[in-house]
C-alpha cells in the first residue's frame, strides 16, 4: 500500500481523552503515539474521524472500562461504532457488550471492535458508550482508528 | 497491496509458545499456521517482531488466559503491546485489562489488541502480560502479528 | 490499495443471521451495512467466505453472546475461526474463550478474533461456536469479514 500521490496511504489512530461532557460519544485526541497520515482523514471536534475519499476502510476501536454490577444499571456496558454520512441517517456499524463485573470497587474489561466498511466522501465515524464515566484513559487502554484499503 | 519487488507485501502472524522464563514478555514461534511474508519482518529471539522498512503498520495481538480471582493478585490481567525503536523510549502502544474470573479452578478470557502505528527501520514490537503462567497456548488461542499498509 | 483491474480490492463484511440449524457453524447474510467488494470473495451457503485468489488476507470475526454459568455447561464459550482449503484438512486459525457470566438471566460478552493468513484459491473460512443459541444477533453485535492485503 505504499502509494503514489494519486493514491496516498490514509490512516488514523487517536487516543482517548477524558471529558466533562455528559454525552455518550467518546472524545479523542492527537496525542501520545497517535497516527494521522495526512489531511484525507481528520479528527473533528475531538469526537469523529472524517474521511475525504470514498472507499473501503478497516475501522476499529478499543475501549477499556471499569464497572461494578451493583453500582451500574442492569444493562451491560455497550460500545458502538457508528457512521454519519452526509444526507443519511446515522447507523450502527459494530457493537460489543460486556456485563458488569462483580469485582470491587470496579472490574476492568476491554472491548475490541473492527470491520471493513464502505465510506462516502465526508463520512464520519464515532464511538458511543453507555457510560463514558466508566472508560479507562490510562496509557494505551482506549483508542480508535481506521485505515483505507 | 499486491506489490512489485519495489514494494513487497510485509506481514507476519506468529503463534504463542509456552516458556519457562520468568519474564513478562510473551514468547512466539513460527509454527502451525503462521505467516512470515519475507525477510522484511523477522521474529527475533522468539519474542519480538522486527521490521526493516519505515511505514504504517497495523499491529495486533490476541491473548487468551485462565485466571481465578482468589488465586491471583488484586490487580487485573493486563496485556500490553509495546514498541522498541533504536535510540527511543520503549513505549506502550496498546493495553487491555480484564478482571480475573470467579470460576474455578480458573476462568478463561480472551483479549484482542490492534492499531495502526508508524514504525521506523529496526523497530520491534512485543507483548507483555502481567502473568505469563496464566496464558493459554492451545491451538489458535494466543497469537501476534502485523501487516504493512 | 485502490488497485487496477489486474489487482482489485477484495474485501467482505457479513452480518450474523439467527438459524434454526443445530450446527455449531454460525450463519451469515449480506444484509444491513454489509460489504462484498466483488465476486472474488463470496458468501457460500450463508456460512463461509470463499476466496478465488491466492494471497495474504486479514480475517476477522466478532461474536457477542449471552450466557449464564448455571444454565451452561462447565466449559467456556469458545469461538473459532476455521479454514477449509481444497484437498486439505480443516484447521483452526484462531480461537477465543470466555467463561460464562454469573449474571441472570444471562450476561453478555463480546469476543474479537483477527489475524493475517495465506489463503489458496477456493479456500473458505467460517466461524464455529460452542453454543450458537447463545449468540446475540442485534444490530452490529456479531459479524465476520476479511480483506486481501
Amino acid at each position: 500500500m505504499q502509494k503514489g500521490d494519486q493514491n496516498p496511504q490514509i490512516a488514523a489512530h487517536v487516543i482517548s481523552e477524558a471529558s466533562s461532557k455528559t454525552t455518550s460519544v467518546l472524545q479523542w485526541a492527537e496525542k501520545g503515539y497517535y497516527t494521522m497520515s495526512n489531511n484525507l482523514v481528520t479528527l473533528e471536534n475531538g469526537k469523529q474521524l472524517t474521511v475525504k475519499r470514498q472507499g473501503l476502510y478497516y475501522i476499529y476501536a478499543q475501549v477499556t472500562f471499569c464497572s461494578n454490577r451493583e453500582a451500574s444499571s442492569q444493562a451491560p456496558f455497550i460500545a458502538s461504532l457508528c457512521l454519519k454520512s452526509p444526507g443519511r441517517f446515522e447507523r450502527i456499524l459494530l457493537r460489543a457488550a460486556n456485563t458488569h463485573s462483580s469485582a470491587k470497587p470496579c472490574g476492568q474489561q476491554s472491548i475490541h471492535l473492527g470491520g471493513v466498511f464502505e465510506l462516502q466522501p465526508g463520512a464520519s465515524v464515532f464511538v458511543n458508550v453507555t457510560d463514558p464515566s466508566q472508560v479507562s484513559h490510562g496509557t494505551g487502554f482506549t483508542s480508535f482508528g481506521l485505515l483505507k484499503l | 497491496m499486491q506489490k512489485g519487488d519495489q514494494n513487497p507485501q510485509i506481514a507476519a502472524h506468529v503463534i504463542s509458545e509456552a516458556s519457562s522464563k520468568t519474564t513478562s514478555v510473551l514468547q512466539w514461534a513460527e509454527k502451525g499456521y503462521y505467516t512470515m511474508s519475507n525477510n522484511l519482518v523477522t521474529l527475533e529471539n522468539g519474542k519480538q517482531l522486527t521490521v526493516k522498512r519505515q511505514g504504517l503498520y497495523y499491529i495486533y495481538a490476541q491473548v487468551t488466559f485462565c485466571s481465578n480471582r482468589e488465586a491471583s493478585s488484586q490487580a487485573p490481567f493486563i496485556a500490553s503491546l509495546c514498541l522498541k525503536s533504536p535510540g527511543r523510549f520503549e513505549r506502550i502502544l496498546l493495553r487491555a485489562a480484564n478482571t480475573h474470573s470467579s470460576a474455578k479452578p480458573c476462568g478463561q478470557q480472551s483479549i484482542h489488541l490492534g492499531g495502526v502505528f508508524e514504525l521506523q527501520p529496526g523497530a520491534s514490537v512485543f507483548v507483555n502480560v502481567t502473568d505469563p503462567s496464566q496464558v493459554s497456548h492451545g491451538t489458535g488461542f494466543t497469537s501476534f502479528g502485523l501487516l504493512k499498509l | 490499495m485502490q488497485k487496477g483491474d489486474q489487482n482489485p480490492q477484495i474485501a467482505a463484511h457479513v452480518i450474523s443471521e439467527a438459524s434454526s440449524k443445530t450446527t455449531s457453524v454460525l450463519q451469515w447474510a449480506e444484509k444491513g451495512y454489509y460489504t462484498m467488494s466483488n465476486n472474488l470473495v463470496t458468501l457460500e451457503n450463508g456460512k463461509q467466505l470463499t476466496v478465488k485468489r491466492q494471497g495474504l488476507y486479514y480475517i476477522y470475526a466478532q461474536v457477542t453472546f449471552c450466557s449464564n454459568r448455571e444454565a451452561s455447561s462447565q466449559a467456556p464459550f469458545i469461538a473459532s475461526l476455521c479454514l477449509k482449503s481444497p484437498g486439505r484438512f480443516e484447521r483452526i486459525l484462531l480461537r477465543a474463550a470466555n467463561t460464562h457470566s454469573s449474571a441472570k438471566p444471562c450476561g453478555q460478552q463480546s469476543i474479537h478474533l483477527g489475524g493475517v493468513f495465506e489463503l489458496q484459491p477456493g479456500a473458505s473460512v467460517f466461524v464455529n461456536v460452542t453454543d450458537p443459541s447463545q449468540v446475540s444477533h442485534g444490530t452490529g453485535f456479531t459479524s465476520f469479514g476479511l480483506l486481501k492485503l
Epitope: K31, Y33, T35, M36, G138 | F89 | -
Partner: nanobody
Framework: EVQLVESGGGLVQPGGSLRLSCAAS????????MGWFRQAPGKEREFIAV????????LYADSVKGRFTISADNSKNTAYLQMNSLKPEDTAVYYC????????????????WGQGTLVTVSS
C-alpha cells in the same frame, strides 16, 4: 521546552544502590513521558526506563528489569531512578529525557534532555 536537571550520580561498589533524580521545569504540561537512557564510553546511548506522566505506567530495558525502579512525583515535577544490585557494567553517564505530548507516531519527535550524571560501579 522542558529543562531537565539530573542529580544523584556517583561512585558505588558492586551490589550497592543509588537513586537518581530528574527535576523538570518549563513546559511541564507538555510532558507525555519521562525516562532514562545511559551511555557507556564507546557505546551507543541505551534506553533504561520510562514512566508515563498520565498514569504512572512504566517500562524497563531487559538489562535492568528487577533491579531498577522508575517513579515520579508529579507534585515536584521530578522523576526518579532507584538502582539496586548495581554491576560494573552499569557504569555510564545517565541521561534524563522528556517526551512531549503531541509526539505522534508519524514524526520522530525530539526529546528534551538533561546534561547527564555519571554513575561509576567499581570496587
Amino acid at each position: 521546552e522542558v529543562q531537565l536537571v539530573e542529580s544523584g550520580g556517583g561512585l558505588v561498589q558492586p551490589g550497592g544502590s543509588l537513586r537518581l533524580s530528574c527535576a523538570a521545569s518549563g513546559s511541564i504540561s507538555s510532558i507525555h513521558a519521562m525516562g532514562w537512557f545511559r551511555q557507556a564510553p564507546g557505546k551507543e546511548r541505551e534506553f533504561i526506563a520510562v514512566i508515563y506522566w498520565r498514569d504512572g505506567s512504566s517500562l524497563y530495558a531487559d538489562s535492568v528489569k528487577g533491579r531498577f525502579t522508575i517513579s515520579a512525583d508529579n507534585s515536584k515535577n521530578t522523576a526518579y531512578l532507584q538502582m539496586n544490585s548495581l554491576k560494573p557494567e552499569d557504569t555510564a553517564v545517565y541521561y534524563c529525557a522528556a517526551e512531549p505530548y503531541g509526539s505522534g507516531s508519524s514524526l520522530m519527535s525530539e526529546y528534551d534532555w538533561g546534561q547527564g550524571t555519571l554513575v561509576t560501579v567499581s570496587s
